[in-house]
């Protein structure tokens, strides 16, 4: 009689994590009588899968009744795969001894690869505002796929980016894989309202890509541009000057008035008008008593945007001309951060 | 969590005995293969001993016929018993989780064995 | 048996910088080759299998290369905590498996 041969026709199996995976495995002999065992690997150090004398092997179950007598299917179904999982797996046959069974052959070893599918991307863009014109950074991380082959791409407002560099770890033979990409934007006054897109493409999502996003409402600071006016005459001896503060983003604002360098009143943006783009604009006004004063009075709008130095536009305001015939806006000036500590 | 606890170390005359225990626990361990590596006092990793899932014992010749390899897989438990033991069998010993790859990935703290006169 | 040569015996670098060693070993052992971490006073650490697969939970900063008989550990940005001794090992032919004379990484 031919001596018996274990027989693995899939050299290779391919599962989606999560779902069960079958090995096969038959024998061509039903001598020499003694049990099969499963094993992950080859070598002094391979990992007990099954085995059919004993032992708990909860995600494993046969796919044939193996105490019946003429069986010679010793197929396996492993169930809920992960990339762990993955490996070659040898389908062995022992022959009865004593004390104990004693290998008697191997089968060729079916490789097990599994398909798992990317996390949702995660887009984190920096930690500090930028201005525009200005160059930032977006990451995008994807964990936990295989194979190791996937695609990634970056849009802003639907548009493809060019710059942005990707890794793929590990280098080598992995369980599973992590992406990891940097993508450069050049911020414009226009991105209050603009979002970063990272899309994840892999065999895994049927064409259905992942998306990760950023909204560059969380990354951009639009500076405010001021304009210093002088409104007509309310009162014989009162000027109402008012300051305009405009497209600027995020909300947060303190305006400070100065008459001749000396603060007159602080005010905190709040009523605030929105434009189309998302920026914000903003007027705060001042009633001077002319009056009140002998000579010129240089009044000063300063305004602290989210945090940064202090920008501010003056206005002069002669006492000696009639109020009425006052020109708006005469040797304005912004004085840039200088005037940060007056207050 | 995956720990591995060595026991049974101390201090013993050249040509005495000792045996080494490994009390494992967090992981199925009838499933994989177990080994000793051991570490003399300021030196590098020297493999020891090897008992695969189905039994089968492998020695370095350093330690080949005097020490032997065993485990109770119902106490998850693997032991060593070293005989004959020389002074240059001083070292810590640690036990370790095989992986079917051949690499050890989890290692117990040693137990130290001294063997002087 | 597979006798595994490491390079250099000490390497001072300092924290932030790239610190990268070798293990040559003396037959091919194609991809089969792994990197521990020791330090003093605690047991080793699996880091890399198959010459550069990071083990479970290790930091993407080491990272292994090579095949056949030339294999390199590198780690791009040292931190206080890798300061230590690391050990290479064929995982090919056994027995007997074979660990390398180590890499001490000390501070500059």
């Known amino acids: 009689e031919e001596e018996l041969q274990v027989i693995q026709p899939d050299k290779s199996v391919l599962v989606a994590a999560g779902e069960t995976a079958t090995l096969r495995c038959t024998a061509t002999s039903l001598i020499p009588v003694g049990p099969i065992q499963w094993f992950r690997g080859a070598g002094p150090g391979r990992e007990l899968i099954y085995n059919q004398k004993e032992g708990h092997f909860p995600r494993v179950t046969t796919v044939s009744d193996l105490t019946k007598r003429n069986n010679m299917d010793f197929s396996i179904r492993i169930g809920n795969i992960t990339p762990a999982d993955a490996g070659t797996y040898y389908c062995v046959k022992f022959r009865k001894g004593s004390p104990d069974d004693v290998e008697f052959k191997s089968g060729a070893g079916t490789e097990l690869s599994v398909r798992a599918k990317p996390s949702a991307p995660v887009v984190s863009g920096p930690a500090a505002r930028a201005t525009p014109q200005h160059t930032v950074s977006f990451t995008c991380e994807s964990h936990g796929f295989s194979p190791r082959d996937i695609t990634l791409k970056w849009f802003k407002n639907g548009n493809e980016l060019s710059d942005f560099q990707t890794n793929v770890d590990p280098v080598g033979e992995s369980v599973s894989y992590s992406i990891h990409s940097t993508a450069k934007v050049v911020l414009t006054r226009e991105d209050v309202h603009s979002q970063v897109i990272c899309e994840v493409a892999h065999v895994t999502l049927q064409g259905d890509p992942l998306r990760g996003t950023a909204n560059l409402s969380e990354t951009i600071r639009v500076p405010p541009t001021l304009e210093v006016t002088q409104q007509p005459v309310r009162a014989e001896n009162q000027v109402n000057v008012t300051c305009q503060v405009r497209k600027f983003y995020p909300q947060r604002l303190q305006l400070t008035w100065l008459e001749n360098g000396n603060v007159s009143r602080t005010e905190t943006a709040s009523t605030v008008t929105e434009n189309k783009d998302g920026t914000y604009n903003w007027m705060s006004w001042l009633l001077v008593n002319v009056s009140a004063h002998r000579d010129d009075v240089k009044l000063t709008c300063q305004v602290e945007h989210d945090g940064q130095p202090a920008v501010s536009k003056s206005h002069d305001l002669k006492v000696s001309a009639h109020p009425k015939e006052q020109g708006s806006n005469t040797a304005a000036e912004n004085t840039g951060s200088n005037e940060r500590n007056i207050y | 969590d995956v720990q591995l606890v060595e026991s049974g170390g101390g201090l013993v005359r050249p040509g005495e005995s000792l045996r080494l225990s490994c009390a494992a626990s967090?992981?199925?361990?009838?499933?994989?293969?177990v080994t000793w590596v051991r570490q003399a006092p300021g030196e590098g990793l020297e493999w020891v001993s090897l008992i695969s899932v189905t039994g089968t014992t492998y020695y370095a010749d350093s330690v080949k016929g005097r020490f032997t390899i065993s485990r109770d897989n119902s106490k998850s438990t693997l032991y060593l018993q070293m005989n004959s033991l020389r002074a240059e069998d001083t070292a810590v010993y640690y036990c370790?989780?095989?992986?079917?790859?051949?690499?050890?990935?989890?290692w117990g703290l040693g137990t130290l064995v001294t063997v002087s006169s | 048996e597979i006798v595994l040569t490491q390079s250099p015996g000490t390497l001072s670098v300092s924290p932030g910088e790239r610190a990268t060693f070798s293990c040559r070993a003396s037959?091919?052992?194609?991809?089969?080759l792994a990197w521990y971490q020791q330090k003093p006073g605690q047991a080793p650490r699996l880091l890399i299998y198959d010459a550069n697969t990071r083990a479970t939970g290790i930091p993407a900063r080491f990272s292994g290369s090579g095949s056949g008989t030339e294999f390199t550990l590198t780690i791009s940005s040292l931190q206080s905590e890798d300061f230590a001794v690391y050990y290479c090992q064929q995982h090919t032919d056994w027995p007997p498996y074979t660990f390398g004379g180590g890499t001490k990484v000390e501070i500059k």
């Open positions: 037959q091919t052992v194609g991809s089969k």
């Open positions: 370790a989780k095989v992986t079917w790859k051949n690499v050890f990935d989890y």
């Open positions: 967090g992981f199925t361990f009838t499933n994989y293969a």
